[in-house]
Interface confidence: low
Amino acid sequence: TQNKALPENVKYGIVLDAGSSHTSLYIYKWPAEKENDTGVVHQVEECRVKGPGISKFVQKVNEIGIYLTDCMERAREVIPRSQHQETPVYLGATAGMRLLRMESEELADRVLDVVERSLSNYPFDFQGARIITGQEEGAYGWITINYLLGKFSQKTRWFSIVPYETNNQETFGALDLGGASTQVTFVPQNQTIESPDNALQFRLYGKDYNVYTHSFLCYGKDQALWQKLAKDIQVASNEILRDPCFHPGYKKVVNVSDLYKTPCTKRFEMTLPFQQFEIQGIGNYQQCHQSILELFNTSYCPYSQCAFNGIFLPPLQGDFGAFSAFYFVMKFLNLTSEKVSQEKVTEMMKKFCAQPWEEIKTSYAGVKEKYLSEYCFSGTYILSLLLQGYHFTADSWEHIHFIGKIQGSDAGWTLGYMLNLTNMIPAEQPLSTPLSHSTYV
């Protein structure tokens, strides 16, 4: 008799990543009968919401519903109607909203309230919108990449499913760079985590993990740029800021009120004799790097070792996956190859930053100027953060793997967040083997 196709017994989940610069919606799918198996959940769709991050809607909360419409409608199309009511929807807001909450809890609550009301209007099983902590952001990013890399699986495979996979079950560290914060998360080697706020304990698939994590608020690439500008304008002799982090010939006017709008620049705030200043690019990598290093206070450390600003950081251990803006920026700069050494990256950054702005605009005509203008800064910032902030060296650079997707799923905190909230990562190893004979039809 001819085999009849059985109806697909699958489940879906939706996570919205409400970042500081934009919001993205991710749709995940998995076989219903394999919920507790490792590596079965995969991303089927990413929808980038048009517009800025939700924290920018403080003065126009009534526009949030429209803002979310396109991507939520896309989710309605992708997910079969019969599955809508049982598909959970989660929204997690990150450092942009943490900053807004620092300024005003009332305003942050108002934004989240409207977001919740908007998302409740869809036929899905809405589970709430919340500001996740920096610690959660780091932890869920770590869970995501190790889940996708198959690190939680106790089964040894005769084949490699991902290019970064190593034979052992040693987990990858996670390096996440956003617009407003950056996270470092990894399992240290036989090292006590000296600061309790940086310690996480997980039991996943029958194995215990003692994980270090820290989220540096205000050290995402966008807020770091605001910090650098606020620091440098303090010593400018007039309303012209000659900036080595922008290409020669680049010019942009900045409002002082915009500069001091974020809590991240408060430590540099001063009364300036002008309301605006003009950035004039001079495109010098070394000077840019030096200016960025001044954002990291490494003179004070109450522990055996620190990253910066007195924050404990254990000795680096194992391989690291660097994702989100770490990947997007380095991919644009064509620096994601495993074969590119740290010295080579530095050399290429020197050349890139020194290129005249007019030349850059011609070479990358399809890229929005706002983004294009900041790649010199962002690339230099990534180097500064990894080398100075996290103590990577030319030798250990090869242990950093710039990752965009793993097995078709974006590296980032959203998958780990959903896995946790849907209880799909068991503490103990499931008793049944993932592929039993009953699987075959």
Epitope: R98, M102, E105, E106, G128, R130, T133, G134, Q135, E136, S195, P196, D197, N198, H214, F216, L217, C218, P263, K266, R267, N297, Y300, P302, N309, G310, I311
Partner: antibody, heavy 116, light 110 residues
């Protein structure tokens, strides 16, 4: 480390400043809080000063207390003490650079007695 | 406004027994909950933060659980040294609150 000082016997209405002196802590990277405990009672949150210098107070404490800081100290001013303010006052450091989620380092406390 | 209600106010437990302390938030605080131990005449000591993460040096006999508005501290294999008052504390909001701490639970070890 964290240590409070300035607790003493005061008469009602006489402003009192308590000082929390820190060592090995960068106040530009840590939130600090003041918590009090009346004799035989529970812990009562007064307010915090975040790394940025912004202050937040419990509803009942607004106008009655003022928190400020220098690079190595965090002050709590009891603007017009009443007998109800008799308590041991603790200073505590927040866990994490910007976090106010929990308090992982506490001083031994300083006793304030308000009596006429 | 993020009021914390802790129960029971007092509990007696035998050495080797298990004690459970509950904490309820009047509004959703997600995972932003910590537990402290305080012995008479001493400063509070952080036991657990972010609901279930053990602070450095704290015995694994202490376990935190819960989410949203309902939280629990469980002490198993109770020892004499565990006699103390335990407080929960929400870290979700530091403004528009009357107290971030629960009223406390006195644990008496027999």
């Amino acid at each position: 480390s964290v240590e409070e000082s300035g607790g003493r016997l005061v008469t009602p209405g006489t402003p009192l400043t308590l000082t929390c002196t820190v060592s090995g802590i960068d106040l530009s990277n840590n939130a600090m809080s003041w918590v009090r405990q009346a004799p035989g009672k529970g812990l009562e949150y007064i307010g915090i000063i975040r790394s940025s210098g912004s202050t937040y107070y419990a509803n009942w404490a607004k106008g009655r207390f003022t928190i400020s800081k220098t690079s190595t100290t965090v002050d709590l001013i009891i603007t017009s003490p009443t007998t109800e303010d008799t308590a041991t006052y603790f200073c505590a450091r927040g866990g994490g650079s910007y976090s106010i989620v929990f308090w992982n380092l506490w001083g031994p406390g300083t006793l304030v007695t308000v009596s006429s | 406004a993020y009021d914390m209600t802790q129960t029971p106010a007092s509990v007696e437990v035998a050495v080797g027994g298990t004690v459970t302390i509950n904490c309820q938030a009047s509004e959703r605080i997600y995972s932003n909950l910590a537990w402290y131990q305080q012995k008479p005449g001493q400063r509070p000591k952080l036991l657990i933060y972010y609901t279930s993460t053990l602070a450095s040096g704290v015995s694994s006999r202490f376990k935190g659980s819960g989410s949203g508005t309902q939280f629990t501290l469980t002490i198993s294999g109770v020892e004499c040294a565990d006699a103390a008052t335990y407080y929960c504390q929400q870290g979700y909001s530091s403004s528009n609150v009357d107290n971030t701490f629960g009223g406390g639970t006195e644990v008496v070890v027999k």
